[in-house]
C-alpha cells in the first residue's frame, strides 16, 4: 500500500529548490530522478538544463508518481542538471537534481618506494600508494600488512584533483619504530565498483650490526 498525503503547497515529497540533490549515475544502468509527488494527479515535467525536456515514452523513460522518473538505461544525455517542475494552483514548483556520472576505471596503482624496502629496526616506515583514475571516479584504498591485527599502521588519504584529465588518490601508510614482526608483504588494494587493482612490496628489517 502506498499512501499519498496531498499538500497543495508542496507538490514534491522532497524539495531541492536551492541546492540540487546529487544523484550518482552509471551509463547503461537504471537512473531514478526521485521527484515523487504528494498527489497522483500532479502533472510533472522533467527538464534538462539548459534547453530540453525529457519525454516519458513508457519504455526507456517512465513516470511513476510514487517514485519519480525512471530512466531504464541512462546515457550521457542525462548527465547534468535535471529539474522536475509542477504547476499547482498557478504556482510553479521546481526541485533540482544534479546527476554525477561515476566510472569504475582504475588507470594505475603504484607504491612509490623502491622494492624491496630495506629499513633499520626502530626507524619509521612510510609507504605511499598512488591510484590514478579518470575524472568522476571514486576509489576505496586499503592496506594489508604483517602486524595488521595490532593496528600498527596509521593511514592518511588525500586526493589531487588539480589535473584536468585524471584524479590522483594517495594513501600513505606509516609505522613508527619498525620491529622484526613488521617485516613482510605490504599490499595496497584499490577498488572502484567492480574494478580492482593491487600492488605490493616486501619490507626487510635490519639491525645496525648487519648494515
Amino acid at each position: 500500500i502506498y499512501i499519498f498525503i496531498s499538500d497543495t503547497g508542496r507538490p514534491f515529497v522532497e524539495m531541492y529548490s536551492e541546492i540540487p540533490e546529487i544523484i550518482h549515475m552509471t551509463e547503461g544502468r537504471e537512473l531514478v530522478i526521485p521527484c515523487r509527488v504528494t498527489s497522483p494527479n500532479i502533472t510533472v515535467t522533467l527538464k534538462k538544463f539548459p534547453l530540453d525536456t525529457l519525454i516519458p515514452d513508457g519504455k526507456r523513460i517512465i513516470w511513476d508518481s510514487r517514485k519519480g522518473f525512471i530512466i531504464s538505461n541512462a546515457t550521457y544525455k542525462e548527465i547534468g542538471l535535471l529539474t522536475c517542475e509542477a504547476t499547482v494552483n498557478g504556482h510553479l514548483y521546481k526541485t533540482n537534481y544534479l546527476t554525477h556520472r561515476q566510472t569504475n576505471t582504475i588507470i594505475d596503482v603504484q607504491i612509490s618506494t623502491p622494492r624491496p624496502v630495506k629499513l633499520l629496526r626502530g626507524h619509521t616506515l612510510v609507504l605511499n600508494c598512488t591510484a590514478t583514475t579518470p575524472l568522476n571516479t571514486r576509489v576505496q584504498m586499503t592496506w594489508s600488512y604483517p602486524d595488521e591485527k595490532n593496528k600498527r599502521a596509521s593511514v592518511r588519504r588525500r586526493i589531487d584533483q588539480s589535473n584536468s584529465h585524471a584524479n590522483i588518490f594517495y594513501s600513505v601508510l606509516t609505522i613508527d619504530k619498525m620491529q622484526n614482526k613488521d617485516k613482510g608483504l605490504y599490499t595496497c588494494r584499490v577498488r572502484s565498483g567492480p574494478s580492482f587493482k593491487s600492488v605490493n612490496t616486501s619490507v626487510h628489517i635490519y639491525d645496525k650490526a648487519f648494515i
Epitope: T43, T53, I55, P56, S65
Partner: antibody, heavy 121, light 106 residues
Framework: EVQLVESGGDLVKPGGSLKLSCAAS????????MSWVRQTPDKRLEWVAT????????YYSDSVEGRFTISRDNANNTLFLQMSSLKSEDTAMFYC??????????????WGQGTSVTVSS | DIQMTQSPSSLSASLGGKVTITCKTS??????IAWYQHKPGKGPRLLIH???TLQPGIPSRFSGSGSGRDYSFSISNLEPEDIATYYC????????FGGGTKLEIK
C-alpha cells in the same frame, strides 16, 4: 492562437526522398515537444516520430526507424521530417502536432491541417 | 507495442441522441487515453485527455471514462456539427491510435 502549417508534401517515386516542414506560431515553440502523425488512405492515424523541445531526444515508430529523421530549428520555429527510402505504404497525409503534458505523459494537443505525400511510380 | 481496438468503426445516430465509442488496449494504459474529433480537410482536435478531462472550450456533452484496458467516449445531445471521425489515443507507451469511428446523423 496556436498555428501549425505543414508543407513539402509531393508525389515521389519509391526509393526517393522528401523533406516536410512545419511552421509553428502562437506558442513558445522551443518549450514544446513535437510529433509527426500520418493518416493512411484507409483513414487510420499512425504516430511517426517525436522530438523533445531542445531536440536532444527523438523517438520513431518501427515502420520508419532508420528511414525518417525528425529535427527542429528553434530559432525559426520550424519542425522537419526528412524521409528517405520511401515506400508505397508511406503514402499518407502527414500532420505535425504539438505535445502537451497530461498527467506526466505527453499527448498531441494541437495539429496542423496536413500535407499530402504520395509514393508511386 | 500497445495495440488499440476501437469500436464500432462506424455508427449512425439521431440528433439529440447519445452515442458511445469504446477502445480496448492490449495492456494497461494507466488512464493515459485521449480522444480526438477529425473533420475532412482539418487536423484532429483534442477533446479529452487522461481518460476523462475535457480540454478547455469543449462542451460537456462530450465525456470519457475507463481504466486499465477498457475506455469509452460518449457524446450526448448530438448536434449536426458532431459529424466527424473520432479516434482514441494511448500515450502511456509511445503513441498508438485506435482505428477510428465514423459518426453519421440519421
Amino acid at each position: 492562437e496556436v498555428q501549425l502549417v505543414e508543407s513539402g508534401g509531393d508525389l515521389v517515386k519509391p526509393g526517393g526522398s522528401l523533406k516536410l516542414s512545419c511552421a509553428a506560431s502562437g506558442f513558445t515553440f522551443s518549450d514544446s515537444g513535437m510529433s509527426w502523425v500520418r493518416q493512411t488512405p484507409d483513414k487510420r492515424l499512425e504516430w511517426v516520430a517525436t522530438i523533445s523541445s531542445g531536440g536532444g531526444y527523438t523517438y520513431y515508430s518501427d515502420s520508419v526507424e532508420g528511414r525518417f529523421t525528425i529535427s527542429r530549428d528553434n530559432a525559426n520555429n520550424t519542425l522537419f521530417l526528412q524521409m528517405s527510402s520511401l515506400k508505397s505504404e508511406d503514402t499518407a497525409m502527414f500532420y505535425c502536432a504539438r505535445l502537451g503534458n497530461y498527467g506526466g505523459y505527453y499527448g498531441m494537443d494541437y495539429w496542423g491541417q496536413g500535407t499530402s505525400v504520395t509514393v508511386s511510380s | 507495442d500497445i495495440q488499440m481496438t476501437q469500436s464500432p468503426s462506424s455508427l449512425s445516430a439521431s440528433l439529440g441522441g447519445k452515442v458511445t465509442i469504446t477502445c480496448k488496449t492490449s495492456q494497461d494504459s494507466n488512464k493515459y487515453i485521449a480522444w480526438y474529433q477529425h473533420k475532412p480537410g482539418k487536423g484532429p482536435r483534442l477533446l479529452i485527455h487522461y481518460t476523462s478531462t475535457l480540454q478547455p472550450g469543449i462542451p460537456s456533452r462530450f465525456s470519457g471514462s475507463g481504466s486499465g484496458r477498457d475506455y469509452s467516449f460518449s457524446i450526448s445531445n448530438l448536434e449536426p456539427e458532431d459529424i466527424a471521425t473520432y479516434y482514441c489515443l494511448q500515450y502511456d507507451n509511445l503513441w498508438t491510435f485506435g482505428g477510428g469511428t465514423k459518426l453519421e446523423i440519421k
